[in-house]
Interface confidence: low
């Protein structure tokens, strides 16, 4: 086999792809020194080891630059598959989420898991709930036994991706009307109450529109 190798590859072992980028190379052990800028990677094959020179280090390793020779060093970060440096992971093992160079089995508070990339991204942040509004039904505060009261909250920070849902920004609950019968037997609310209802409706609409404006802006920017 050895002789046939020499006959078919007259130039020398350098035509063996494993010797690409080497300054010194042997058929049995591969590279022992690499050209400038390339990374030396020591690979195990059973009981054997061989060296190769690579432009970038394989998965599970990072490029460590040194004056004598650049080397591929193994990632030591827990649950990390590939890393950029000894303490910054770029891809986590299956089932773990990447967050600021580390791997977590669940995303920290305020961050949401993005399943397609297995990263933790900034979640949707909402403000505090407003007070419950006036109990009303069909925009009236009298004339019925039961009505609905609503409260709202605003989006403080939109999510990093529009696929990440924001929590509810308006919610309603059943309430008992303060006045079962309208004064003077009329079912129409007073002018002042009418103004209040209008204000409250606008507040709810604004809060609900806010999220869709964010989404529309995001899509336009993509």
């Amino acid at each position: 086999q050895g002789n046939r190798w020499r006959r078919s590859k007259r130039a020398s072992y350098v035509s063996n792809p494993i010797c690409k980028g080497c300054l010194s190379c042997s058929k049995d052990n591969g590279c022992s020194r690499c050209q400038q800028k390339l990374f030396f990677f020591l690979r195990r094959e059973g009981m054997r080891q061989y060296g190769e020179c690579l432009h970038s280090c394989p998965s599970g390793y990072y490029g460590h630059r040194a004056p004598d020779m650049n080397r591929c060093a193994r990632c030591r970060i827990e649950n990390c598959d590939s890393c950029f440096s000894k303490d910054f992971c770029t891809k986590c093992k299956v089932g773990f989420y990447l967050h600021r160079g580390r791997c977590f089995d669940e995303c920290p508070d305020g961050f949401a898991p993005l399943e397609e990339t297995m990263e933790c991204v900034e979640g949707c942040e909402v403000g505090h709930w407003s007070e419950w509004g006036t109990c009303s039904r069909n925009n009236r505060t009298c004339g019925f036994k039961w009505g609905l009261e609503t409260r709202t909250r605003q989006i403080v920070k939109k999510p990093a991706k529009d696929t990440i849902p924001c929590p509810t920004i308006a919610e309603s609950r059943r309430c008992k009307m303060a006045m079962r019968h309208c004064p003077g037997g009329k079912r129409t609310p007073k002018a002042k109450e009418k103004r209040n209802k209008k204000k409250k409706r606008k507040l709810i609409e604004r809060a609900q529109e806010q999220h869709s404006v964010f989404l529309a802006t995001d899509r336009a920017n993509q």
């Epitope: 086999q1 494993i18 190769e52 599970g60």
Partner: antibody, heavy 119, light 109 residues
Framework: QIQLQESGPGLVKPSQSLSLTCSVT????????WSWIRQFPGKKLEWMGY???????YYNPSLENRISITRDTSKNQFFLHLKSVTTEDTATYYC?????????????WGQGIQVTVSS | ELVFTQPQSVSGSLGQEISISCTRS????????VSWYQQQSSNKPRLLIY?????PSGVPDRFSGSTDSSSNSGILTISRLQPEDEGDYYC????????FGSGTQLTLL
Amino acid sequence: QIQLQESGPGLVKPSQSLSLTCSVTGNSITSSDWSWIRQFPGKKLEWMGYMNYGGGTYYNPSLENRISITRDTSKNQFFLHLKSVTTEDTATYYCARERPHPYAYFDVWGQGIQVTVSS
Amino acid sequence: ELVFTQPQSVSGSLGQEISISCTRSSGNIGSNYVSWYQQQSSNKPRLLIYKFDQRPSGVPDRFSGSTDSSSNSGILTISRLQPEDEGDYYCLSGYDKYVFGSGTQLTLL
């Protein structure tokens, strides 16, 4: 003597996930690299992805969004998980021992398992 | 996308020598190793040649591998054809993504 044996369901419904197991005897999975390869009914072979001895994975870019390869070192098994299957995923699935980059060859193969995707 | 093209079929007579080519679509055939596999009647593939021209133990020396830079191809040569050589033959190459050749059916006349 190294032996590989695939196991798993022979029939999977479209849109479901496919999970296969490769049981290895005669070789610790932590000392070699392992691949999944499939062969379509028209005989075309496709390399799906590999897991190196340290547990690192590399996948065929055409399957990257659907595939994951995991392992259980205590049982000396590695697994193929393929999400959202379609009838196009009907094939014979092989696990194989891979001689490492850059040598690119598979010296030991399992018998293969026929998987049909159909409703 | 990297593609390795093989002839769909080749045929030969008993005792004859045949060659199967595996032509790389882009890039140099010598930049990644080439291996060859034999598959008989829907059995599992069997490694015949690795690292261009190396033969695993148990594979007869009638099987040999080489490269032809002028056609940018890997070549599998089978000499002294035997009846048991009938079947499908596949090449494989690549680095970060392995790609199999399209496959060649060998039939004996």
